[in-house]
C-alpha cells in the first residue's frame, strides 16, 4: 500500500474574471483495488448513493474527472447497491480518471479495498482519512472548481505539475 | 463564481412557443445534469425534466411529453428550455437547476424566468 | 408516479422552537430523499440529501432523517431566517417529484 500524494488547487474567480489559486498537499494510500500510478482531473464530489444503479440512464460524463466520496457509517447505509470496490468501478466506467474515498466514518471500507482483486481497477483508487481527509473535505465542500494530483512520489514544485 | 444565469421574463399568447436559457459559469459544464422545474403563482415545484449536457439526451416528465425540447449548447456552456402550445396554466417561474453527480438533488438553481401566458 | 406527501402543510412557531416536519412517499425510495428551503420570490435553496447529508453552508440546526417512506426534516432551534416554505423531494426515479410544501410562520 503506497502512499498517494495528492495535490489539491482550489479556483478562486473575482468578479473582474480574474482568479487566484490555492494548493494544498495531503497524503493518502493507493488501494489494491486500483493502479498505483499518477492521474490528474477536476473533482467531482460524489456521494456513495450516487453510484447505485437506481437511475433510469446511462450517467455517463465526460472523462478525466476525479470522484472524490465521502463514505458514510456503515449503520446509514446496513444493504449497500453496491460494494466500495463496486462504487469505484462505476465511478471509473462513469469517466472518472481516479477516485479518492474518504473512509474517515467507515474504516472498514480499507480492508474491503485492498483485499487483493483478480482483475484491479487499470485507475488509482486512494483512500485518505484523519487530518487529510478534513482538509480535503474542506477544499471540495467549498462548491468552487479544484482539481486534483495523484501521484506516487512526492511532488517537487507545485508549479511544475499545474500549467494555470 | 458557480453560479446559473437564466434569461428574462417572457409575455406570450396562447398556442405560441417561449425559449428559456439557462448559463452556467464556474464549473465544468458537462459533468452535472441540468434539470427544469416550475412554479405556478402561489403553488409548489413542478419537475418538468432533464438533460445530460455530456451526451444531450434528455429524459422529460411525461405531463410535458410532446410539448416540451431541451437542448444545450457546449461552446457557450448554456442550456434552453423550450415549451410549445402555450395555456393560461403555463404561466409559472421556470427554474433551471443543476443536480449533483449520480444524483438527482439540486445544488445550483438559476434565479427564476417568469413566463406569462395571456391573450 | 410516486407521491411525496408532507405534513403539516403550514405551522405557526416562535424563535427557539424545535419545528419538525414531516414527508412521507407513496413507495420505499430508500434514502433518496432531498429538503429545500424556499423565500418568497426566491429559488429554492437545498438543506438536506440523501435523507440525512446537510449540503455545504447550511447550518447545522438542520438535520434530516428517515429511510424507505418516512422521513422528517427537524430545525432544532428556530432562527428569523427560517421562516419559509419547506419542500421534499425524491430523487429515486423520474419523474422527479416534490411534497407540496410546509409554510412556516412566526407565532
Known amino acids: 500500500k503506497e502512499t498517494a500524494f495528492v495535490e489539491v488547487v482550489l479556483f478562486e474567480s473575482s468578479p473582474s474574471g480574474d482568479y487566484t489559486t490555492y494548493t494544498t498537499g495531503l497524503t493518502g494510500r493507493f488501494s489494491r483495488a486500483g493502479a498505483t500510478l499518477s492521474a490528474e482531473g477536476e473533482i467531482v464530489q460524489m456521494h456513495p448513493l450516487g453510484l447505485c444503479n437506481n437511475n433510469d440512464e446511462e450517467d455517463l460524463y465526460e472523462y478525466g474527472w476525479v470522484g472524490v466520496v465521502k463514505l458514510e457509517q456503515p449503520e446509514l447505509d446496513p444493504k449497500p447497491c453496491l460494494t466500495v470496490l463496486g462504487k469505484a468501478k462505476r465511478a471509473v466506467q462513469r469517466g472518472a480518471t481516479a477516485v479518492i474515498f474518504d473512509v474517515s466514518e467507515n474504516p472498514e471500507a480499507i480492508d474491503q479495498l485492498n483485499q487483493g482483486s483478480e482483475d484491479p481497477l487499470k485507475r488509482p483508487v486512494v483512500y485518505v482519512k484523519g487530518a487529510d481527509a478534513i482538509k480535503l473535505m474542506n477544499i471540495v465542500n467549498k462548491q468552487k472548481v479544484a482539481r486534483a494530483r495523484i501521484q506516487h512520489r512526492p511532488p517537487r514544485q507545485p508549479t511544475e505539475y499545474f500549467d494555470m | 463564481q458557480v453560479q446559473l444565469v437564466q434569461s428574462g421574463a417572457e409575455v406570450k399568447k396562447p398556442g405560441a412557443s417561449v425559449k428559456v436559457s439557462c448559463k452556467a459559469s464556474?464549473?465544468?459544464?458537462?459533468?452535472?445534469?441540468m434539470h427544469w422545474v416550475r412554479q405556478a403563482p402561489g403553488q409548489g415545484l413542478e419537475w418538468m425534466g432533464k438533460?445530460?449536457?455530456?451526451?444531450?439526451?434528455?429524459s422529460y416528465a411525461q405531463k410535458f411529453q410532446g410539448r416540451v425540447t431541451m437542448t444545450r449548447d457546449t461552446s457557450t456552456s448554456t442550456v434552453y428550455m423550450e415549451l410549445s402550445s402555450l395555456r393560461s396554466e403555463d404561466t409559472a417561474v421556470y427554474y433551471c437547476a443543476r443536480s449533483g453527480a449520480g444524483m438527482w438533488y439540486f445544488d445550483l438553481w438559476g434565479r427564476g424566468t417568469l413566463v406569462t401566458v395571456s391573450s | 408516479d410516486i407521491q411525496m406527501t408532507q405534513s403539516p402543510s403550514s405551522l405557526s412557531a416562535s424563535v427557539g422552537d424545535r419545528v419538525t416536519i414531516t414527508c412521507r412517499a407513496s413507495q420505499d425510495i430508500y434514502r433518496y430523499l432531498n429538503w429545500y428551503q424556499q423565500k418568497p420570490g426566491k429559488a429554492p435553496k437545498l438543506l438536506i440529501f440523501a435523507a440525512s447529508s446537510l449540503h455545504s453552508g447550511v447550518p447545522s440546526r438542520f438535520s434530516g432523517s428517515g429511510s424507505g417512506t418516512d422521513f422528517t426534516l427537524t430545525i432544532s432551534s428556530l432562527q428569523p431566517e427560517d421562516f419559509a416554505t419547506y419542500y421534499c423531494?425524491?430523487?429515486?426515479?423520474?419523474?422527479?417529484?416534490f411534497g407540496q410544501g410546509t409554510k412556516v410562520e412566526i407565532k
Open positions: 438533460i445530460n449536457p455530456s451526451s444531450g439526451s434528455t
Open positions: 464556474g464549473y465544468t459544464f458537462t459533468n452535472y445534469k
Open positions: 423531494q425524491q430523487s429515486y426515479t423520474t419523474p422527479i417529484t
